[in-house]
């Protein structure tokens, strides 16, 4: 076709951004391009072209009119992880092509098993008590909070400090006795550790 004066090659005007999304959830990788004639958009993951509903009507990935890639649900198995990877969109017309910046799609995860469950502790009143916990593996890395007798502990209380996976109670009182649970949390949800009993005895 003959070059028309008003035609111009594609340029990406909206680049995709990195995203972390939970398995089974929908998400979108944005891409918008300008050009005349209007460029076609294709997506590539880890260097390989991504199939969408344009290739297979049953696909869980849809190429939107804007050029964005919409995932009906993020698919992520024990082994096969077809949606996780590094994506680029490529806009093409007869005058050339434009490639977006890389965008990573990572799948959030939170395993069930705690790396370290807290264990029972026995202390004398007035002594410090330390309960330790390491949350399950996860992405993003899980944070933790603690519950006593199923109620979240107020971390602002002056005798309580939480650093890393350690709950430290200084100058313990009889009222501190009870069942303590460590809770690991990230965007996927929450996981409760096995409970540990804190026993406080009078000297």
């Amino acid at each position: 076709s003959r070059l028309r004066q008003e035609d111009f090659p594609p340029r990406i005007v909206e680049h995709p951004s990195d995203v972390i999304v939970s398995k089974g959830e929908p998400t979108t990788l944005n891409c918008k391009a300008e050009g005349r004639p209007t460029p076609t958009i294709e997506w590539y993951k880890d260097g390989e072209r991504v199939e969408t509903d344009k290739d297979d009507p049953r696909s869980h990935r849809m190429l939107l009119p804007s050029g964005s890639l919409f995932f009906l649900r993020i698919v992520h198995g024990r082994r096969s992880k077809p949606d996780e990877g590094t994506y680029v969109c490529v806009a093409r017309n007869y005058l050339g092509e434009a490639v977006s910046r890389n965008a990573s799609l990572e799948v959030a995860l939170l395993r069930d098993d705690f790396r370290q469950n807290p264990t029972d502790v026995v202390v004398a009143a007035g002594e410090p008590a330390i309960l330790e916990c390491q949350p399950p593996r996860g992405h993003p890395e899980p944070t933790i909070y603690w519950k006593k007798d199923k109620v979240r502990i107020d971390e602002k209380e002056e005798r309580i400090s939480i650093r890393g996976g350690k709950l430290m109670i200084s100058n313990t009182r009889k009222s501190d006795a009870g069942m303590y649970t460590c809770v690991g949390t990230n965007m996927v949800g929450e996981r409760d550790s096995d409970p540990a009993e804190l026993t406080v005895f009078e000297r």
Partner: antibody, heavy 118, light 105 residues
Framework: EVQLVQSGAEVKKPGASVKVSCKAS????????MHWVRQAPGQGLEWMGW????????EFPQKFQGRVTMTRDTSITTAYMDLSRLRSDDTAVYYC???????????WGQGTMVTVSS | DIVMTQSPSSLSASVGDRVTITCRAS??????LNWYQQKPGKAPKLLIY???SLQSGVPSRFSGSGSGTDFTLTISSLQPEDFATYYC???????FGGGTKVEIK
């Protein structure tokens, strides 16, 4: 259309090797693990191992370790299964199968009959 | 290794019958259990994944249930095209059950 197309039937002598190919099309080849499953005449399904096309990592059950090799060529979206030191009880139909993100074998090749006979 | 035990190994049934096939794992596999149908000379076909999820395009007369070690595949009303061999598979270590052949009574 998502499909797996396997190479044709083979007749081999005991002690020889066989290499079966599995050409994938219609999907992102590197996103899904590829498995090999065999079925001896009149018998059930036996899992032989997997390959991750993204990095070439493989895993096999103890029974096949040292005798099976799985490779892939991402440029032509093809997986290969090589079985060495063939015996008569290796006579079977060999299938490649894609593992979905739901942890199941959702797409299967048509099967390749391998006959081991002296 | 996780061993999958299917029962019965074969059964005879008539069109319209309700058919139940069971699969037992030698240790807990949570819901990592799939069911396949295979007809003579054909590759297996996925029916149910994750113990109870129906694969796209599979008739709703097929259903799966169970978790842990005990699982069931049910065909609510057997159709002529359902006479085949059915396999369970655990997707932790990937082994298959021995199969159940459903024959015409």
């Amino acid at each position: 259309e998502v499909q797996l197309v396997q190479s044709g039937a083979e007749v081999k002598k005991p002690g020889a090797s066989v290499k079966v190919s599995c050409k994938a099309s219609g999907y992102t080849f590197t996103g899904y693990y590829m498995h090999w499953v065999r079925q001896a005449p009149g018998q059930g399904l036996e899992w032989m191992g997997w390959i991750n096309p993204k990095d070439g990592d493989t895993e096999f059950p103890q029974k096949f370790q040292g005798r099976v090799t799985m490779t892939r060529d991402t440029s032509i979206t093809t997986a290969y299964m090589d079985l060495s030191r063939l015996r008569s009880d290796d006579t079977a139909v060999y299938y490649c199968a894609r593992e979905s993100g739901d942890d199941a074998f959702d797409i299967w090749g048509q099967g390749t009959m391998v006959t081991v006979s002296s | 290794d996780i061993v999958m035990t299917q029962s019965p190994s074969s059964l005879s049934a008539s069109v319209g019958d309700r058919v139940t096939i069971t699969c037992r794992a030698s240790q807990s596999i949570s819901s990592y259990l799939n069911w396949y149908q295979q007809k003579p000379g054909k590759a297996p076909k996925l029916l149910i994944y994750a113990a109870s999820s129906l694969q796209s395009g599979v008739p709703s007369r097929f259903s799966g249930s169970g978790s842990g070690t005990d699982f069931t595949l049910t065909i609510s009303s057997l159709q002529p095209e359902d006479f085949a061999t059915y396999y369970c598979q655990q997707s932790v270590g990937l082994s298959f059950g021995g199969g159940t052949k459903v024959e015409i009574k």
